[in-house]
Structure formats: C-alpha cells, structure tokens
Amino acid sequence: QSVCAGTENKLSSLSDLEQQYRALRKYYENCEVVMGNLEITSIEHNRDLSFLRSVREVTGYVLVALNQFRYLPLENLRIIRGTKLYEDRYALAIFLNYRKDGNFGLQELGLKNLTEILNGGVYVDQNKFLCYADTIHWQDIVRNPWPSNLTLVSTNGSSGCGRCHKSCTGRCWGPTENHCQTLTRTVCAEQCDGRCYGPYVSDCCHRECAGGCSGPKDTDCFACMNFNDSGACVTQCPQTFVYNPTTFQLEHNFNAKYTYGAFCVKKCPHNFVVDSSSCVRACPSSKMEVEENGIKMCKPCTDICPKACDGIGTGSLMSAQTVDSSNIDKFINCTKINGNLIFLVTGIHGDPYNAIEAIDPEKLNVFRTVREITGFLNIQSWPPNMTDFSVFSNLVTIGGRVLYSGLSLLILKQQGITSLQFQSLKEISAGNIYITDNSNLCYYHTINWTTLFSTINQRIVIRDNRKAENCTAEGMVCNHLCSSDGCWGPGPDQCLSCRRFSRGRICIESCNLYDGEFREFENGSICVECDPQCEKMEDGLLTCHGPGPDNCTKCSHFKDGPNCVEKCPDGLQGANSFIFKYADPDRECHPCHPNCTQGCNGPTSHDCIYYPWTGHSTLPQHARTP
C-alpha cells in the first residue's frame, strides 16, 4: 500500500490559496494510508479533489474546515484510527465549510465506506449547505463507548436538503441508493464481539477486523483493528524473539516483522529505524541509533546516550576562549568533547569587560557526563570552594589530538584543589602532562602516570604541589582498600585498582555472598549481583553461583526448565503458536494441553482457561533472551 505522512497544521494555512491546494494534492495524490492526520483546509469551491479517492485509512484525525468545495470525495476511506485527535477529542472534525458571503460550501460528505473510527469522536457543525450528515448512525461507526460530548452532529444543511433514498431506511451519505450507510455493528447478533457482515451468529467478523468484513476469517476484514500481516489481521506482528520450549529461552525469530503503522513489514522504510519491533522516525531520547546486520535499530543506552559536542575553539564555540556562563549550557548531556575544555579566570570568575557573568559552580556538574575529550584539558581557574575535579569523574580518555603548547593536561596554580578525583581516567593518548603550583594538591604522587600514556615520547611535569610527606602526615593518603597502584583522592572509589574486591568502581573487603540486602557471586575479584529471580538464601548458603536466572540456588518465583522466571510463559510467541504453561505445586512450569489456546491451570484439556469474546493480546516477555 502506498503510505504518506500526514500534517499537523490545524487551521493554519498558506496565504496563497493556489499553493494551499497544490500542497494538499502533492501530499495525498496516490496515497492509500495517511500515517498521521488528513487536514483539508482553505480549499476553494472549484478545485478538483478527485485525488482524495485513493485514501483508504487515516491513522490520526481527519479535519475538513474553512473550505468552499461542494463534495468531499473520500469515498474509499474505511477507517480513522484516531491515534491523534483534533483538540484531543475528535477523530473526525468537519466545520465552517461555506463561504460567508456566497452560495459555495460543502453539501455532501462522500464518506460512504467509512465504517470505523477506533478512537475519538465526531464534530460536524456550522456547514451551512451540508445535507445528510445528521441521518448517519454515528454510533455504528464510532468504536469507543458513547460519551455524548464526544459527538456533535448538528442539522447543518438548509431546509433544501433532500431525503435518503427509500432503500436506505433513513440513513445515507447522499440522495441515491448508492449512498446508503452500511451498518456493521449495531445490526449484529449479540454474540458477535465486534463487527459483522449480516444479522446472524454465523455472520460475525473475526475479532481482529475493523470496519466490517466480507466473511468470518481474519483475511476477510475490510481493515484491521491492530495489524495487517500479509492480508491477515493479527493482534501483533511476528515477534523479534520466539520462545523455544526445548531451551526454555527466547530466541531470534527469522520470520519476525516490524510494525509500521497498522502493517507488519519485513523491513522498515529506508528513512525509519526499528524501536522495539516498530518502525519509528527517530529513536526516543533514552535510546541511540545503531546499525546491526544492515538494519538501523534503537538500542537502550546503558547510562546516558552518547552525544558529541563542540569544545572550546571548535565549531559553534569557535569564538569562545574559555568555558563561561554564556556557553556552559551547551555542554549539557555531552559524553564526548570534540576539541578542548579550557577553564580560565575570565570564565570561572566572569569577565565584566566582555559582559560575561561568573559561572555558578553548581553548573560545572554538566561535565559529569563527559567520557572523552579529543583535544586537551586546560584548568587555570576553578571555583575557590571546589576542592577537586570530581565533575570529571567519568572522564576516561584525553585524546590530545590538539595540544596546548605540547600539553594535553594542564592544571596550574589551583590553591583550593586537594585531590584530582579523575577516578575513571584510563588514557592520555598524546601530549604531555603539566600539573604545577597547586599548593594543596595531594595524591598525585601515588599514581604511575606513564600507565596512562599511549606513546613513549609523552612527558610529565608535576612539581611544586603539596609535598608528599606533608600529605601523608595529614592523613591525605589512599584508602586501605586501594592497591599499590595509587589513587586519585580519598575514599574507596578513588583507587586505580583494588587490594581485594570491587563492586562497580568501589573497592570493598569482600562480596555479599552470604549476607547483605543484595546477594552476589565472585567473578574473579569483581562482585556481581545475583539475578533478581534468585531467592535470597539464609543459613550460610550461596544465593547464586554465577550470572543469569539459571544459576540460582533456588527460584524466587517459578522455574521454567533451568531458568528462574517471574511467571510461567503465558502467551509467549513460539515458532508456530503461542506458548502457555501452568505451575505445579513445586512452582515448576509445564506446558498446557495443546487444546488450550488461552492458558490453563493444569495439564489436561479440562484445565483450559477460556476468556469469552476476547483476544489474548497481552503477551508478556518473561523468558530469558540468550
């Protein structure tokens, strides 16, 4: 099907009406599915709108307002999904379609195939010449429960309106027998849980149909309630992962499809990315775009999403000489600085000559997200009440691609600094280090700086800081849990490496193997938390002996094969069917009888659970992915 993007201009239009018409035509010519809103506004009376006949489906709302044409030829529009609503209420809004000072205006709605509005109401008002709209049985079209304030259809037309053709039983879109409204819901047998194609119990449409059908199967629908998978209406598209009953794990499904609007597609359109099995225009802020096997996908960021920013003297900050109060906000959420970070007195304390206020020291916390500086770090001024550079606690690499007089790290004359606290710094790729005249700085002498270097010609000048013996005398020494590799400052989180064990970046005496709120196992010298599905053990027993839900001593909830799970598989997509299991008295999961298609409480066909008139559409993912 040919898909086009909708608009969201509401009532605003181009001042040139010719342009307005051309834009409408360009948007919707040969378009079958409008992915968004269909807005038809400010169109003159003599315009050819026959191109609108191609439209079959609108995912958002339909707005028809401020027009002068006589007939709205949306003759093939079957369904308005109402994923976005006009004024947050209406899926269909038709108003003010007449010329105030003349005889032009909307007389007839050509919506003869409109049989479904999935969400939202209808507003048809102030259409001076409009006929027949008030004869339509809107309750048959509108799916959601019927709040009277959500549908307003006034008797728009003048007294000159004709009647419906006698074969239409009083409900029509226009005057002839071809204009009768087709009812697909209010005429159905009460056993039908959706729409129908006749009055008998045998005439119910499949529950996945929207807008009616020509037969009982999921392939007979006029439109789909949820998704169209190669002509069949389905609750969900074939999932990326399917449950393998042999391995008790979710495994990659090579028949997976992605949701694109209301369609299941093998591949997203080229300008879309995959996010959780859906085709989206852009990744949400908590995810980043990556390419895997030629497919652009949204992957959750482990911490903060990568964001590269210009450094001082680069790109948008080409004119800046220092980080200052007028540019510091440009560093919010940056993980990589392309260029340099420079801190001069004119930035930290302000520069009245140049209309720059002093920096609020709290704002320096923006640098906590920075992991890489590709150029140099030059600190020649720092707020007097800040005794360390812990705002750079996540800085891993100083690239030194650009150097300051041969230096990639310069810390000069900072009397208030007592420790560096560059606790994540692992590499200074190029350039020399110059840390001098910081009269209160300690801990610097415990570090073997050359381990940070990438080349043999890098040099270190560290002098005229606080004497090492004075630091030791005042107890400004590495924490006892640090190894002999040294530290960046006081505390067990500042060690270059640990004497015993580590939890995250903190050095500890021992892992929580047998006690503590969160139990752990030892992976070498690293303490790793047990899987959340493991039950916390007492009496000197290990809670787990490795990672994952298959290494628990005992399960916290249920056990599916070797894996501890939150609950037994309940509608997980398998290779060919949905997987349902029940829990035995020992809380172990076992497959339901093959006849049970909606779950069970035991092994036999008599234990099946049956939900009348509903589709089983909540399919939680409780199994383990490899």
Epitope: S319, Y353, I356
Partner: antibody, heavy 113, light 110 residues
Framework: QVQLVESGGGVVQPGRSLRLSCAAS????????MHWVRQAPGKGLEWVAV????????YYADSVKGRFTISRDNSKNTLYLQMNSLRAEDTAEYYC??????WGQGTLVTVSS | QSALTQPASVSGSPGQSITISCTGT?????????ASWYQQHPGKAPKLMIY???NRPSGVFNRFSGAKSGNTASLTISGLQAEDEADYYC??????????FGGGTKLTVL
C-alpha cells in the same frame, strides 16, 4: 593593530530612528564583548551598552533601556546600535569600544527638529 | 546608575603631583577591582591610563598611578607636565553588570 571605525551618525528628528555601525579589524572580533559610550557636546562620558562575544548577553544604561538595541554580526566583524524614539538629549558623539583599551574616533548624532 | 563623583577641576604646576578622587558606592567602585581612568584631550577619543584600579597599559608613563580605598578610587599624576592637561574620567563596573563613568575632572597645568 586594533581599529574601530564608527559610522551612521547624522541629523535626525526627535522620535525617529537611526542605526550606528562599528567596523572592527586587527583582532578576533568574535571573541570579545563590545561597548558603546557617548559624550554629549561639552559634557562627560556616558556608558551606553555592552554585548558579549556571542551576543548572548546585553546590558544597557537606564537612560536608553527599551529604546536602544545593541547587536553584532560576527561574520562581518561589525557592531551595531539601533536607536529608536530618539530625544534631544541623545545628541552626542557615539564611540564604540573594545573595553577597556581600544576606542574608535566616534560618530556624531544630532537629534533636532 | 548614578555617575561617580569626581572634583570638577584640579590644577598643579609642572613637576608637582596631583590626585584626582572618584567616589562611588559598594555596588560599583567599592565592590569590584574594575576601576579605570581615561584621559581625553579636546576633540579626541578617550585614552586608557589605568585599568583594574592600579594597572598601567603599555605606553603609559609610570608617572600615572592608581589606587583604591573603600568606595573611592584615585588617580595620581606625579611630575606633572604640560601635555597632561586634559579631562580625566573614572569608570567602574557595577553590580547590575553595567558600567558607570564619573562626571569628569578638568586638569589644568599652571
């Protein structure tokens, strides 16, 4: 060497507008804040306005606030002063300055009916 | 933004020393070390003589010196010379991020 050349002065009626320009050369214009200072005939210096290097901060003397607008175009190395609702007391020599050292030679604005 | 207070005129003989005062408030002169002094000859643009209370730009003779006490800045010219005859203005940064000048002092070399 730093050079600042003001232009755009002239005679204008009260209530009308005028735009002064200051062409800068001999330094990296886009890295410095710039000021306007004026001096009425036979009177003392009066500071008028300042703009930061990137245009993000602007400050004005109370006497011109709401009537004058300082702006800059870093791509053209030019500073501007848009003067609206001019009054007789705005008559002065207007200097552009790179504080505190470098000043232009000034341009004369006369507000008279 | 009231102008800083300077004496309207001072005078001295060649070779003598004179001092020009500039009184403000704690919101300008007293609150910041951004007091400057400018010399202006008739028909010419102002010339910076002292910046940041006591610093001399290159090219300014060391006969010119600046100081500050409380809310008052001062400019001292020693070894007065005929070419020192001019108007002198003090200038200070203020707490509202603006700048303010003094009313000016006419120096006459007798």
């Amino acid at each position: 060497q730093v050079q600042l050349v003001e232009s755009g002065g002239g005679v204008v009626q009260p209530g009308r507008s005028l735009r002064l320009s200051c062409a800068a050369s001999g330094f990296t214009f886009s890295s410095y804040g710039m000021h306007w200072v004026r001096q009425a005939p036979g009177k003392g210096l009066e500071w008028v306005a300042v703009i930061s290097y990137d245009g993000s901060n602007k400050y004005y003397a109370d006497s011109v606030k709401g009537r004058f607008t300082i702006s800059r175009d870093n791509s053209k190395n030019t500073l501007y002063l848009q003067m609206n609702s001019l009054r007789a007391e705005d008559t002065a020599e207007y200097y552009c300055a790179k504080y505190p050292l470098n000043w232009g030679q000034g341009t004369l604005v006369t507000v008279s009916s | 933004q009231s102008a800083l207070t300077q004496p309207a005129s001072v005078s001295g003989s060649p070779g003598q020393s004179i001092t020009i005062s500039c009184t403000g408030t704690s919101s300008d002169v007293g609150g910041y070390n951004y007091a400057s002094w400018y010399q202006q000859h008739p028909g010419k643009a102002p010339k910076l003589m002292i910046y940041e209370v006591s610093n001399r730009p290159s090219g300014v003779f060391n006969r010119f010196s600046g100081a500050k006490s409380g809310n008052t800045a001062s400019l001292t010219i020693s070894g007065l010379q005929a070419e020192d005859e001019a108007d002198y203005y003090c200038n200070s940064y203020t707490s509202s991020s603006t700048w303010v000048f003094g009313g000016g002092t006419k120096l006459t070399v007798l």
